[in-house]
């Protein structure tokens, strides 16, 4: 529920991790809570301890296997429960039938590097991390470049509507320091959201040659 006093939200990274956030107004910080995951067609179940991330929210990661193992598919349903300790017993607080491939959030792209830099242009590449082979090429990217004197929020978004793990930035200013970030999103999933932004990649354009514009 959007307007309630509590909210339980989870996302699947498409491989072996379900990340969950439980927020509850007025809850005590030292409340001990867990997320329990029970798949409908798998032999395993998993639990993680919710740890405080802010005044009224807790988060944890359900680690389902090794980072690149494919632990769930589009037909899986995982029943997720929030259990909180009340005295000597555990009380269920929330329950959710979780469809992993309807609630995707991939890991941030990694291994950003400058392939080639000139005075006005820079070619940058990156890799996606722990992304399911099920997507094949059905991914899109957003990128942004931080210019001097601006904030990330002011940076215009560049959209790559295909699985393209590189970009050629144009119309840059010579001898100028920039930063670059990229994020990824599968096309699949009603509640799928963008990955976190990658770590920023800093680069500098080449100075203009003397005697030229």
């Amino acid at each position: 529920a959007v307007n309630g006093t509590s909210r339980f939200t989870c996302f699947y990274n498409s491989r072996a991790n379900i990340s969950c956030v439980w927020s509850q107004d007025g809850a005590l910080q030292d409340t001990s809570c867990q997320v329990h995951a029970w798949p409908d067609r798998r032999r395993w179940n998993q639990t993680c301890e919710l740890l405080p991330v802010s005044q009224a929210s807790w988060a944890c990661n359900l680690i389902l296997g090794t980072p690149d193992s494919q632990k769930l598919t589009a037909v899986d349903i995982v029943t997720l429960r929030v259990m909180c300790r009340e005295g000597v017993r555990w009380r269920m607080m929330a329950i959710q039938d979780f469809k992993p491939f309807e609630n995707l959030r991939l890991m941030a792209p990694i291994s950003l590097q400058v392939v080639h830099v000139e005075t006005h242009r820079c070619n940058i590449s990156w890799k996606i991390s722990q992304a399911s082979h099920y997507f094949e090429r059905h991914l899109e990217f957003e990128a942004r470049t931080l210019s001097p004197g601006h904030t990330w929020e002011e940076a215009p978004l560049m959209t790559l509507k295909q699985k393209q793990e590189w970009i050629c930035l144009e119309t840059l200013t010579p001898d100028t320091q920039y930063e670059f970030q990229v994020r990824v999103k599968p096309l699949q999933g009603e509640f799928t959201t963008w990955s976190p932004w990658s770590q920023p990649l800093a680069f500098r354009t080449k100075p203009a040659a003397l005697g030229k514009d």
């Epitope: 529920a1 006093t5 339980f8 929330a94 959710q96 469809k99």
Partner: nanobody, 126 residues
Amino acid sequence: QVQLVESGGELVQGGASLRLSCAASGRTFSNANMAWFRQAPEKEREFVALITWSSGSTLYADSVKGRFTISRDNARKMVYLQMNSLKPEDTAVYYCAADGPPYSGTYYRYDTYDYWGQGTQVTVSS
């Protein structure tokens, strides 16, 4: 938008059975939580039972455990509450509620739920 319409409420004698129905229409979610709440005069709305739409997991208030059964028919987009061994204290307006994904909240709190029906009156006489 999700629309919920309850039916089946009536006046019955203590010890009788009754089945309430809730018809869902509009943009229904395959992974929503569906619940029944009830509200007696001068009292707060209270949780009765819940069913998860996909897996069919169920939860009940202690006061109705063993007497009430919640079920659903996915194809018809219906949720039911079978009420047996009714008692006068079960008298209330019964509401169907839905908690739409991708969020869920504290299941027994009424302010968690996004969508509500208009209610159906159940009266149990002694």
